[in-house]
């Protein structure tokens, strides 16, 4: 671990901020798990920097990350999924900074998909449905979903609804008539596993019906 003292680049490197963050994705590719890490500071010179994870692995001491542009990435079946691993930023054999992380507490689910909205004329409501790959998984099965919707003209006025199922009913009377709405959904682990919100699903756009003047109800699209 010595032998670098005369290396001016390394001495400079030790003054830098190598703080980093990571997230895990379980069964992201069949039975393979992934771990992704990146530096908090986008200006860090990553030329000679490597990431390594040691501990809480199956029948190996350590694994090295692959570098993909600005991120570092591992895909493996060898996570024990219990206890803390030691994740280190390294230059050669020297560790610059390390963090002990339990991979089950930094899980980022895959984004939901197939989001759609169907208007039910008789019920005067909108049925929102979406899908998640996590229904088929062995580990991160229980998720909390965050459905966010807004009137397209209201840039930052999102309304959020949390739910554990993949179906939501929006009452017509709670929405503006004859308006275009944008809706999207994301997920977070909600049982045993902990972590971060997934990326947002692709947005879905729908229009609310006009108000029928005689009855005060909206016309269907």
């Amino acid at each position: 671990e010595s032998g670098y003292a005369q290396n001016g680049d390394l001495e400079d490197a030790e003054l830098d901020d190598y703080s980093f963050s990571c997230y895990s994705q379980l069964e992201v590719n069949g039975s393979q798990h992934s771990l992704t890490c990146a530096f908090e500071d986008p200006d860090v010179n990553i030329t000679n920097l490597e990431f390594e994870i040691c501990g809480a692995l199956v029948e190996v001491k350590c694994l090295n990350f692959r570098k993909l542009q600005e991120i570092y990435f591992i895909e493996t079946k060898k996570f024990l999924l219990i206890g803390k691993s030691n994740i280190c930023v390294k230059v050669g054999e020297k560790s610059l900074t390390c963090k002990k992380i339990d991979l089950t507490t930094i899980v980022k689910p895959e984004a939901p998909f197939d989001l759609s909205v169907v208007y039910r004329e008789g019920a005067n409501d909108f049925v929102v449905t979406f899908n998640t790959s996590h229904l088929q998984k062995k580990y991160v099965k229980v998720l909390m979903h965050d459905v966010a919707y807004r009137q397209e003209k209201d840039e930052n006025k999102w309304t959020h609804v949390n739910l554990s199922s993949t179906k939501l009913t929006l009452l017509q009377r709670k929405l503006q008539p004859a308006a275009m709405y944008e809706i999207k959904v994301r997920s977070i682990p909600d049982h045993y596993f902990k972590g971060f919100w997934s990326e947002w699903s692709p947005s879905y756009y729908f229009r609310t019906p006009e108000i029928n003047n005689s009855s005060g109800e909206m016309d269907p699209i």
Epitope: C54, G55, A56, V58, C62, L81, I82
Partner: antibody, heavy 119, light 105 residues
Amino acid sequence: QVQLVQSGAEVKKPGASVKVSCKASGYTFTGYTMNWVRQAPGQGLEWMGLINPYNGVTSYNQKFKGRVTLTRDTSISTAYMELSRLRSDDTAVYYCARGDGDYWYFDVWGQGTTVTVSS
Amino acid sequence: EIVLTQSPATLSLSPGERATLSCSASSSVTYMHWYQQKPGQAPRPLIYEISKLASGIPARFSGSGSGTDFTLTISSLEPEDFAVYYCQEWNYPYTFGGGTKVEIK
């Protein structure tokens, strides 16, 4: 209090198999690894393998791979170690030990199970 | 696989004396643990992660070291400290040293 209670002593013939149990109490069984360590008479300690009780994932010492099988029954908070194709040099005390997942040391040990292999 | 060599194999000391036990690794180890074992008993943890005292362990026990060289020190031996001591690496395959027996002189 946290406790690991192992099954009783066994006498086996060469070529046979032995299955040792380890019942955990006083903590959440699925929250810690269960490790197995053996000690031959007058010798040091040798780690054999571990199991993650939450998902059944195992990690074995290469020396024992193929001969040792670790399993668990979460409904009764019990871990099992089965060693097959027994030889006389498998005569030892077999310990189960809870693994502390923050620091990876064995913080709680069973009382040990003596396995004697003799023809 | 890392080999842990403990020295001396036997340490003969009197109660009240200071005991210094060494554990040398064949390659660099991030963390080291220490256990005590008495005849007919299971091992019990003494020191984890190089220098942290396990639950219920008296302060006369201390650990130090880094890289390939680690030390367990007992500042003043009590009668109940005469036992065998093992070092162990924190990572797969969780190798133990051969042990140091601390006996009464």
